[in-house]
């Protein structure tokens, strides 16, 4: 039904030339190139080298971006499903390759990998039953979502499932576990003394990544997990359900993977690309797979399961959603229904399947060996109206605009790489495999990565998550862009953004958040230490408490959802294109990289204060085990002073001296890299950034000084306090060393 592509597909295998021919040609070409490159570099001034004329500046690039084109591209990308590993998504990859070539990129290649994906069984559907004492099924959950009008005859709509769930038919009493967060299980197990061992747990979606929910349930001893969307989280008051509004109907279900990969990429080839000669682990040794069956349902079906719940009452109002059910915790059903059980029927399969990235190159005129990357995924769960195609359509228009400038004779100073990633929904697989394959190039040449998944998750204001190195770039760029918001006509994007999403620390400035994970920047930032950022339009978090947007990963995420309810004029999409495209333009074209290391100094101090305050909740233990943060604060102080001096030198140095310019830019480029610990974080070898990592309790959220944070987490419950506080001290020393070492990369080189 989903026309899977397997590793045997040889249609895209490339012809090989004799190696000696390639090598000889390279030596000759390389020699001439080097001579010409050096000659050209020394005789040109920096401004001439980047070929910036009034016609070919950022304004020309931004003016070329058109809302109408983004709309057209979105429509084109959303007419059929583009599930990873399917023929339809391969065809879309080839279409994008062809169009990027037409737009004018120097080269556009498909790169394929054979990775572990997961699909429902076509003849044996997944569902959940309520069974009576005789084992008869008296209620079954839905087999698919009611298709939206106009899409009834579309084939290959994958039914809702939890990707990578193992097969199984567990049967037992139900326990309601709220959001299945770490603190929810603490409440259940420690305060309420409810044991989930041998039980099927039902958890509501929201607050944290679904994979963390499943991991927590597994650790609690559950035999299965049911995930559901509660109207409290996925139905905004006063808004109609799709197709009459943007809310989730009762039959709508959120798909998604439930892996705990911790940055590994393909579960069978951690650390290495899943290519033809890759060694693959057995399924039992695969990284991050869940061990218990998991299945998602909508709130109509959840109502049927929850309305019969007995046992303990919910501990407080934070455990109650909006359904007309008691939200009892269980275990099991109440009085009359106590003999009834819940049974899961999960028959999904995991299989090695071929995926395709599209990689486009626009070669830099002056520093072709410095890469600025704009990447977003192409694969969707169904139509992908928002996720990912609202992002892919923006990337497409950015490529078109850059291509137009190139056709007029312009080139960026640095090389720009454009990527359409595959299999993001299955664990960030396409981007991670490509980065694994190209890690040596990327760690030496990667200047920045800008992510481009969904352009919108609302239409209220801008949302940016990025490295502190990019703060000033984002502030300066948004001051130059016009706000699309009603009531801010003629005002800057910076102004509307600051008004609607103020920084909690600095008045008159907008909020910028930490990078977490759950998207394709992960490998670039958390593993490789390449400065990264992301931007999209978002909802009003003050008034809209629902998690993500209501129709996330459902069949109702259509073109019409965007065109009718979110962005009829595509003005928010255009603004996001200007922000993402503008960042790429500046990163690729500025003579001096637009990074400000002083902003890292500011946040390092803030993060050191925060982790110190967490530790100070245990003053007696800190005294007993001689735990001190003095060294960390000293390193942060050193970083601040060295960053300040570096910034002065950066302001004053001779920018017409290409060697000096390259030297200063390299210090800026490699600063993010300096925060990488080659050994990685404890039990998370692919999360190597010492300042930031995805939270161990929620992959979507970023945590600062994660090594120290995790060592301190729930430390009062550790059986061996001496060992636990020893680990805190070890993590403080690692953080101290890393901050000091990073500072020294900014020192004057001689």
């Amino acid at each position: 039904m989903w026309n899977l592509l397997h590793e045997t597909d040889s249609a895209v295998a490339t012809a090989r030339r004799p190696r000696w021919l390639c090598a000889g040609a390279l030596v000759l070409a390389g020699g001439f190139f080097l001579l010409g490159f050096l000659f050209g570099w020394f005789i040109k001034s920096s401004s001439e080298a980047t070929n910036i004329t009034p016609k070919h500046n950022m304004k020309a690039f931004l003016d070329e971006l058109k809302a109408e084109n983004i709309k057209k591209f979105l429509h084109n990308f959303t007419q059929i499903p583009h599930l990873a590993g399917t023929e339809q998504n391969f065809q879309l990859a080839k279409q994008i390759q062809s169009q990027w070539k037409e737009f004018g990129l120097d080269s556009v290649e498909l790169t394929h990998y054979d990775v572990l994906l997961s699909y429902p069984n076509k003849t044996h559907p997944n569902y959940i039953s309520i069974i009576n004492e005789d084992g008869n099924e008296i209620f079954n959950t839905s087999l698919f979502e009611p298709p939206p009008a106009g899409y009834e005859n579309v084939s290959d709509i994958v039914p809702p499932f939890s990707a990578f769930s193992p097969q199984g038919m567990p049967e037992g009493d139900l326990v309601y576990v709220n959001y299945a967060r770490t603190e929810d299980f603490f409440k259940l197990e420690r305060d309420m003394k409810i044991n989930c061992s041998g039980k099927i747990v039902i958890a509501r979606y929201g607050k944290v990544f679904r994979g963390n929910k499943v991991k927590n349930a597994q650790l609690a001893g559950a035999t299965g997990v049911i995930l559901y969307s509660d109207p409290a989280d996925y139905f905004a008051p006063g808004v109609k359900s799709y197709p009459d509004g943007w809310n989730l109907p009762g039959g709508g279900v959120q798909r998604g993977n439930i892996l705990n990969l911790n940055g590994a990429g393909d579960p069978l080839t951690p650390g290495y690309p899943a290519n033809e000669y890759a060694y693959r682990r057995g399924i039992a040794e695969a990284v991050g797979l869940p061990s218990i069956p998991v299945h998602p349902i909508g709130y109509y079906d959840a109502q049927k399961l929850l309305e019969k719940m007995g046992g303990s009452a919910s501990p407080d109002s934070s455990w109650r959603g909006s359904l007309k059910v008691p939200y009892n915790v269980g275990p099991g059903f109440t009085g009359n229904f106590s003999t009834q059980k819940v049974k899961m029927h999960i028959h999904s399969t995991s299989e090695v399947t071929r995926i395709y990235n599209v990689i486009g190159t626009l070669r830099g005129a002056v520093e072709p060996d410095r890469y600025v990357i704009l990447g977003g995924h192409r694969d969707s769960w169904v139509f992908g109206g928002i996720d990912p195609q609202s992002g892919a359509a923006v990337v497409h228009e950015i490529v078109r605009s850059f291509g137009t400038l190139k056709k007029e004779g312009w080139r960026p100073r640095r090389t720009i790489l454009f990527a359409s990633w595959d299999a993001e929904e299955f664990g960030l697989l396409g981007s991670t495999e490509w980065a694994e394959e190209n890690s040596r190039l990327l760690q030496e040449r990667g200047v920045a990565y800008i992510n481009a998944d969904s352009s919108i998750e609302g239409n209220y204001t801008l949302r940016v998550d990025c490295t502190p190195l990019m703060y000033s770039l984002v502030y300066n760029l948004t001051k130059e862009l016009e706000s699309p918001d009603e009531g801010f006509e003629g005002k800057s994007l910076y102004e509307s953004w600051t008004k609607k999403s103020p920084s909690p620390e600095f008045s008159g400035m907008p909020r910028i958040s930490k990078l977490g994970s759950g998207n394709d920047f992960e490998v670039f930032f958390q593993r490789l230490g390449i400065a990264s950022g992301r931007a999209r339009y978002t909802k009003n978090w003050e008034t809209n408490k629902f998690s993500s947007y209501p129709l996330y990963h459902s069949v109702y995420e259509t073109y019409e959802l965007v065109e009718k309810f979110y962005d009829p004029m595509f003005k928010y999409h255009l603004t996001v294109a200007q922000v993402r495209g503008g960042m790429v333009f500046e990163l690729a074209n500025s003579v001096v990289l637009p990074f400000d290391c002083r902003d890292y100094a500011v946040v390092l101090r803030k993060y050191a204060d925060k982790i110190y305050n967490i530790s100070m909740k245990h003053p007696q233990e800190m005294k007993t085990y001689s735990v001190s943060f003095d060294s960390l604060f000293s390193a942060v102080k050193n970083f601040t002073e060295i960053a300040s001096k570096f910034s002065e030198r950066l302001r004053d140095f001779d920018k017409s001296n290409p060697i000096l310019l390259r030297m200063m830019n390299d210090q800026l480029m490699f600063l993010e890299r300096a925060f990488i610990d080659p050994l990685g974080l404890p039990d998370r070898p692919f999360y190597r950034h010492v300042i930031y990592a995805p939270s161990s309790h929620n992959k979507y959220a970023g945590e600062s000084f994660p090594g120290i944070y995790d060592a301190l987490f729930d430390i009062e419950s550790k059986v061996d306090p001496s060992q636990a506080w020893g680990e805190v001290k070890r993590q403080i020393s690692i953080a101290t060393f890393t901050v000091q070492a990073a500072a020294e990369t900014l020192s004057e080189v001689a």
């Epitope: 569902y127 008296i138 209620f139 079954n140 959950t141 839905s142 087999l143 698919f144 979502e145 009611p146 298709p147 939206p148 009008a149 009834e152 109907p249 009762g250 039959g251 109509y300 079906d301 049927k304």
Partner: nanobody
Framework: EVQLVESGGGVVQPGRSLRLSCAAS????????THWVRQAPGKGLEWVAY????????YYAAPVKGRFTISRDNSKNTLYLQMNSLRAEDTAVYYC????????????????????WGQGTMVTVSS
């Protein structure tokens, strides 16, 4: 035009079987639960069976449970009622009806709400 058209009725002997069909058009069939309802001569309407939009749940009135089977083929926009072990008291005009609520999956104890009916097909069980 939104319509439901039943077929397959006729005269049949007690103990025999009959299969009714209902062809739907003009609406998103795969998004709506559907029902069979009957009216015996001189009597009021009696609900017979319900099937959810996706076919996962089927509910039956007590007099027909174990003898009748409701099914659907969404690819053909068709609803079926397989009637086995027919009895004289099954004699009635059988109507298919569309549930009023899109995407709703009703339970056994729900109160059903129909908004579109077919013209009916007569089933006579007689020796």
């Amino acid at each position: 035009e939104v319509q439901l058209v039943e077929s397959g009725g006729g005269v049949v002997q007690p103990g025999r079987s009959l299969r009714l069909s209902c062809a739907a058009s003009g609406f998103s069939f795969s998004g709506y639960g559907t029902h069979w309802v009957r009216q015996a001569p001189g009597k009021g309407l009696e609900w017979v069976a319900y099937i959810s939009y996706d076919g996962s749940n089927k509910y039956y009135a007590a007099p027909v449970k174990g003898r009748f089977t409701i099914s659907r083929d969404n690819s053909k926009n068709t609803l079926y009622l397989q009637m086995n072990s027919l009895r004289a008291e099954d004699t009635a005009v059988y109507y298919c009806a569309k549930d009023a609520a899109w995407g709703l999956r009703l339970g056994e104890s729900s109160s059903y709400d129909f908004d579109i009916w077919g013209q009916g097909t007569m089933v006579t069980v007689s020796s």
